[in-house]
């Protein structure tokens, strides 16, 4: 099949899927599109993973390119290393495979670069400008387990149709990620829908065992049951619904209590009414009607901004008066011109080489903006209570299979995401020390629950999703805005969620987040034009829920390829890099632990509500903070505070000064 047909296609193994999206996108747009589907740009770190990518891409045209998840900041060349100074978007440089098109050549690496894979031939890696919209991109979706494809049964009317959590529909999968739906049509009746779920005894499996189309009692029409038919001991048939659904009055069909959209923002099955409503970060339930959400006015909190504060729907921004500029903490103001100098000092003089010519001096801010910053955020807690988020996955997405990107404008990610499905790489980083910035104030111990590794798939209903509060360390808890649950009582102290401090962004050199330099926007514009966040611009958080009605997908069926691969042990003291370089096809490079230096910490610029970068959850066991590509830059006068998901107790200022109708692109990171 031609991978350049209109529809995406995928190939799944027992622990991850790759998907090819033939959509013209810049690197940032591609990264966002993968993130919004719960994945990441592809990171083929081993020869086995690369083989799966090869099988998926096939023999495409030489003129076409696909983004993969590799990027490098300006002047970050490390030509002696396998990735040459490039970093995976998952935040690390570990690899056991490379496929560069050319041998490394010396050079100053003056500009930021991203990597695209050739669609033809050997699928070599090429580097180039990140702002070019290449022909497509490869996403990778990791998960804890997968269900094998169903065996065809004699009574089936056709092959099972599978819908994955990342919206691909096909009859051709060999492995189905946790959370996938299988729709089986039977000759004698309406058939059955199954969900790939977590099994009580461990592992994952289909929500019901076969045979699906044969047998007495529940045959031939599933006993008239919409979901599950149970043959009781006395011979009569009773119907049951999968988790999150309730049996309708007719005793046969199942209804989703959230299907009628009773909640303004987020709905979750369960509770006395069959559902409970929740509000996103920056909103709280209306006192007169818990189904509605009203904006939390953070500007009413004393000291939230040093000078001026503007509240808008779903968030707030700090401003400074004329002659002052916003500091990197997004709160404080300093006399204009003071910040840049201090920022340079913080970075170290090595970034600004006095010996460089005019061109290099012009790029000093690029070097500054191109550093790495820890993206702090949400800790996902131990399984103690039902989650405080609606599980927004529906098995059939006729209109949503393509990531909803208003191209060429960057997307509007959700303000807060449920935990991402962890991506378990077969290559574990054992080399990078965690260096905590010594300048961040220590928060009270009650605000720092233990880090629980995100090893459960995102659908697991026993995941605790915390109530997130924008906690300012110097304020009493009564002033802390956050997501409020209508249906759950306050948590006891033992399960107190982590508090997000918007005041002290934390710098972890080991966990890297991309940076972008400043954007040219007049301060007068930013202080008078404050676009509110549109409520419906962001797609639903793609988490997986067992409560959705299993149904035959109505989306077009895609052909896929699947390759079963051996599971590689995840603890390796060192990595061997196999390279498909045309110069040395069998080249093996040993990467000792000592060769992984931490990157320089860098202050984090701000970002406006017109172009928010998705908050992200851990997707990789050895780097809890993925890279966040950015095409826009910061303004010293503007900052938007949003939480991001990383295993720390402090959030990050994600802000930029581009206006809604004037979004600039750049070759650099946030």
């Amino acid at each position: 099949q031609d991978p350049w047909a209109a529809e995406p296609r995928s190939a799944c193994g027992p622990s991850s899927c790759y998907a090819l999206f033939p959509r013209r996108r810049t690197f940032l747009e591609a990264w966002r599109a993968c993130r919004e589907l719960g994945g990441d740009l592809a990171t083929p770190r081993t020869p086995e993973e690369a083989q799966r990518v090869d099988n998926l891409v096939g023999a495409g045209p030489a003129s076409r390119l696909l983004w993969i998840g590799l990027q490098r900041q300006a002047r970050q060349c490390q030509l002696q290393r396998p990735l040459r100074g490039f970093t995976w978007t998952t935040g690390d440089q570990d690899t056991a495979f490379t496929n560069w098109a050319q041998p490394a050549t010396g050079g100053p690496c003056p500009a930021q670069r991203c990597v695209a894979l050739e669609a033809s031939g050997e699928h070599r890696w090429l580097e180039g400008s990140c702002t070019l919209a290449v022909d497509g991109y490869l996403c990778q979706f990791g998960f804890e387990g997968a269900c094998p494809a169903l065996q065809d049964e004699a009574g089936q009317a056709g092959p099972a149709v599978y819908t994955t959590p990342f919206h691909l529909v096909s009859t051709e999968f060999e492995w189905l990620p946790f959370g996938s739906v299988a729709a089986v049509q039977c000759q004698a009746g309406r058939g059955a829908s199954l969900l790939c779920v977590k099994q009580p005894e461990g592992g994952v499996g289909w929500s019901r065992a076969g045979p699906l189309c044969l047998g007495a009692g529940c045959s031939p029409d599933n006993g008239g049951c919409e979901h599950e038919c149970v043959e009781e001991v006395d011979g009569h048939v009773s119907c049951r619904c999968t988790e999150g659904f309730r049996l309708a009055a007719d005793g046969r069909s199942c209804e989703d209590p959230c299907a009628q959209a009773p909640c303004e923002q987020q709905c979750e099955p369960g509770g006395p009414q069959g559902y409970s409503c929740h509000c996103r970060l920056g909103f709280r339930p209306a006192e007169d009607d818990p189904h509605r959400c009203v904006d939390t006015d953070e500007c009413q909190i004393a000291g939230v901004c040093q000078q001026m504060c503007v509240n808008y729907v779903g968030g707030f921004e700090c401003y400074c008066s004329e002659g002052h500029e916003l500091e990197a903490d997004g709160i404080s103001c300093s006399p204009a011109g003071a910040m840049g100098a201090r920022a340079s000092q913080d970075l170290g003089d090595e970034l600004l080489d006095d010996g460089e010519d005019e061109e290099d001096e012009d790029e000093a801010w690029e070097a500054f903006g191109g550093g790495w910053t820890e993206m702090p955020g949400i800790l996902w807690m131990e399984p103690t209570q039902p989650p405080d988020f609606a599980l927004a996955y529906r098995p059939s997405f006729p209109e949503d299979r393509e990531p909803q990107i208003p191209y060429p404008e960057p997307t509007w990610p959700p303000p807060l995401s449920a935990p991402r499905v962890p991506y378990h790489s077969s290559v574990l980083s054992v080399t990078r020390p965690v260096v905590v910035s010594a300048t961040r104030p220590t928060l009270p111990s009650a605000h720092q629950p233990p880090v629980i590794p995100a090893t459960h798939p995102a659908l697991s209903r026993d995941h605790q999703i915390p109530v997130i509060a924008a906690n300012y360390p110097d304020l009493p808890s009564a002033y802390q805005p956050g997501i409020l649950s209508v249906s759950h009582p306050a948590q006891p102290p033992a399960h107190q969620p982590p508090m997000i401090s918007t005041r002290y962004p934390e710098l972890f050199p080991a966990h890297q987040s991309p940076m972008f330099p400043d954007t040219q926007v007049a301060g007068t514009q930013t202080t008078t034009h404050l676009p509110a966040i549109p409520p419906n611009r962001a797609p639903l958080v793609t988490t997986l829920g067992a409560h959705q009605p299993p149904q035959a997908p109505d989306a077009p069926v895609l052909r896929t390829q699947a390759t079963q691969l051996p599971i590689i042990p995840t603890a390796q003291p060192s990595l061997t890099t196999s390279s498909r370089s045309p110069v040395s096809p069998a080249h093996q490079v040993s990467v000792p632990a000592a060769t992984q230096p931490p990157a320089l910490p860098t202050l984090l610029p701000s970002q406006s509500p017109t172009n928010q970068t998705s908050p992200i959850s851990p997707t990789h066991p050895h780097s809890k903070v993925p890279q966040i590509p950015r095409e826009d830059g910061p303004s010293p006068k503007l900052a938007l505070w949003l939480p991001s998901a990383a295993p720390t107790a402090a959030p990050t200022a994600l802000g930029e000064a581009s206006l809604a109708e004037h979004i600039q692109r750049d070759d650099r990171w946030l």
Epitope: E118, C130, A133, Q664
Partner: antibody
Framework: QVQLVQSGPEVKKPGASVKLSCKAS????????IHWVKQAPGQRLEWMGY????????TYNQKFKGQVTITVDTSASTAYMELNSLRSEDTAVYYC?????????????????WGQGTLVTVSS | DIQLTQSPSFLSASVGDRVTITCRAS??????VAWYQQKPGKAPKLLIY???NRYTGVPSRFSGSGSGTEFTLTISSMQPEDLATYFC??????????FGQGTKLEIK
């Protein structure tokens, strides 16, 4: 070596049509996108549109949409551009150019080879 | 559309001179900029791609620099055969290429 050879000069009356050709040699024709660029006297170069010979995918500059049609004959390794409803302001040199895919391990979308150009004169 | 403005439009230089041509973009184009040389009656030839990479076979006296909105083509030592018009081109919003108006380089 790579070559793009364009058809000869044309003189047309207003309202007429003209079809220009661009024959490629020295490389695999379906591996590279072909662009067409206009250079009117005293004016800057203007991108008109492209075709990918691999799958006939075309995209046009909004300014020329409706007036221009780009096609290929892969068996002849030739790209064509037809200009309809000619006006005096269509008097220009028209170039076909190949978009590069990669240079020395870099991908890039600059135009690495150009035809010699075809002068089209529109005059009553 | 992204506009490119070259300066100067005309330039006279002597053999051996260092020549600098500037190209400004109306908005950020990253490094998606190329430079072309066009001799009278001929087709343009690619000199520099991706803002700073010299194309195969181009003499080392030609160099490019810049990123974002400001780009420079430099001829370190002007030669008689460099008499030509030089164009910058951006392609960050590919396939919508735009070109600068050109800089005509003459020999003094």
């Amino acid at each position: 070596q790579v070559q793009l050879v364009q058809s000869g000069p044309e003189v047309k009356k207003p309202g007429a049509s003209v079809k220009l050709s661009c024959k490629a040699s020295g490389y695999t024709f379906t591996d590279y996108v072909i662009h067409w660029v206009k250079q009117a006297p005293g004016q800057r170069l203007e991108w008109m549109g492209y075709i990918n010979p691999y799958d006939d995918d075309t995209t046009y500059n909004q300014k020329f949409k409706g007036q221009v049609t780009i096609t290929v004959d892969t068996s002849a390794s030739t790209a064509y551009m037809e200009l309809n409803s000619l006006r005096s302001e269509d008097t220009a040199v028209y170039y076909c150019a190949r978009r590069g895919n990669s240079y020395d391990g870099y991908f890039d979308y600059s135009m690495d080879y150009w035809g010699q150009g075809t002068l089209v004169t529109v005059s009553s | 559309d992204i506009q490119l403005t070259q300066s100067p439009s005309f330039l006279s230089a002597s053999v051996g001179d260092r020549v600098t041509i500037t190209c400004r973009a109306s908005q950020n184009v990253g490094t998606a900029v190329a430079w072309y040389q066009q001799k009278p009656g001929k087709a343009p030839k690619l000199l520099i791609y991706s803002a700073s990479n010299r194309y195969t076979g181009v003499p080392s006296r030609f160099s490019g620099s810049g990123s974002g909105t400001e780009f420079t083509l430099t001829i370190s030592s002007m030669q008689p055969e460099d008499l030509a018009t030089y164009f910058c081109q951006q392609y960050t919003n590919y396939p919508m290429y735009t070109f600068g108006q050109g800089t005509k380089l003459e020999i003094k």
